[in-house]
């Protein structure tokens, strides 16, 4: 009954921002689904979750320490986060559930993707004392 | 904490109209189903109507189609069952329930009792 | 509509027994099989769902197992608290059907 994801199991972020994409084996359309992302080995911190149908357009909510928003089409959930910096670095899970009508489905947990935020080094050019 | 709060019921003749309410807190409202379960004085269970989270979807047990209806209202966090042309056998305890994998939040019930 | 029998309808059994209330589908429902306890003028409390998964909150005395069509309810060591009547509940397909309930009273 379980549904399967499939994530990019690498992700290596140079700028702030990156667009974190979700494929499932389920049409999005087919029930009232709540699509989410959660972050740490243990899924500790809901990073962002949005609810969808076909009617309507989710609003994707973030946890306060991340900027999010999503989108969808029938088979593919896309997170977009910002503002992210190098403690962003972590692996994060792609989440289904449908909610409504039952019965009520969830995902397997995919192997999710590891988001490698790079560290900005700023380069100093240094001046040679002057004797 | 999760909280459920039903109002709305009382006494109303056969034929008459009610308007409950459940005012719900403690969790994201929009993102669950929510319903209405009946219990009659001394009976068992029975659902009664539920709507998706986005409040598109309804759907409602065979003895109330027609005369039931209902609704949510997720700026306010309140879900409502508007009952028309009652009927003695609508008399029960009315709770509204969440709806996630199973009903795992009740609130404490609302009388309606149908009575000339 | 998916039908819901549970039985007994009554029991009567004493503090520290072991009590199994059964309930049966009238087709598969796969695992989407829930508990719940009532006690007198109060709401029903879920104690099982998804057949065999212990809700938060709830002692490990209960537990629930079944698939298809027959699923179980067992109380391992029955606690003052635990008289009450108890209801499954189907959410495979919709509409939500409830069984009739099982009343466990004092021997």
């Known amino acids: 009954n379980k549904i399967l994801v499939k994530q990019s199991p690498l992700l290596v972020v140079d700028s702030n921002e990156v667009s974190l994409s979700c494929r499932y084996s389920y049409n999005l359309l087919a029930k009232e689904f709540r699509a989410s992302l959660y972050k740490g080995v243990n899924s500790d911190v809901e990073v962002c979750v949005g609810n969808g149908n076909f009617t309507y357009q989710p609003q994707f909510r973030s946890n306060a320490e991340f900027n999010c928003d999503g989108d969808f089409d029938n088979e593919t959930v896309t997170f977009r986060l910002w503002n992210l910096h190098v403690n962003h670095t972590d692996i994060y899970f792609c989440k289904i559930e449908f909610m409504y009508p039952p019965p009520y489905l969830d995902n397997e947990r995919s192997n999710g993707t590891i988001i490698h935020i790079k560290e900005k080094h700023l380069c100093h050019t240094q001046s040679s004392p002057k004797l | 904490e999760v909280q459920l709060l039903e109002s709305g019921g009382g006494l109303v003749q056969p034929g008459g109209s009610l308007r409950l309410s459940c005012a719900a807190s403690g969790f994201t409202f929009s993102s669950y189903a929510m319903s209405w379960v009946r219990q009659a004085p001394g009976k068992g269970l029975e659902w009664v109507s539920a709507?998706?989270?986005?409040?598109?979807?309804?759907y409602y047990a065979d003895s109330v189609k027609g005369r039931f209806t209902i609704s949510r209202d997720n700026s306010k966090n309140t879900l409502y069952l508007q009952m028309n042309s009652l009927r003695a056998e609508d008399t029960a305890v009315y709770y509204c329930a969440k709806r996630y994998i199973a009903f795992d939040y009740w609130g404490q019930g609302t009388l309606v009792t149908v009575s000339s | 509509d998916i039908q819901m029998t549970q039985s007994p309808s009554s029991l009567s059994a004493s503090v520290g027994d072991r009590v199994t209330i059964t309930c049966r589908a009238s087709q598969s429902i796969s695992s989407y099989l829930n508990w719940y306890q009532q006690k007198p003028g109060k709401a029903p409390k879920l104690l099982i769902y998804?057949?065999?998964s212990l809700q938060s909150g709830v002692p490990s005395r209960f537990s629930g197992s079944g698939s298809g069509t027959d699923f179980t309810l067992t109380i391992s060591s029955l606690q003052p608290e635990d008289f009450a009547t108890y209801y499954c509940?189907?959410?495979?397909?919709?509409?939500?059907?409830f069984g009739q309930g099982t009343k466990v009273e004092i021997k």
């Open positions: 998804a057949a065999s």
């Open positions: 509940q189907q959410g495979g397909m919709p509409p939500d059907t």
């Open positions: 709507i998706s989270g986005s409040g598109g979807s309804t």
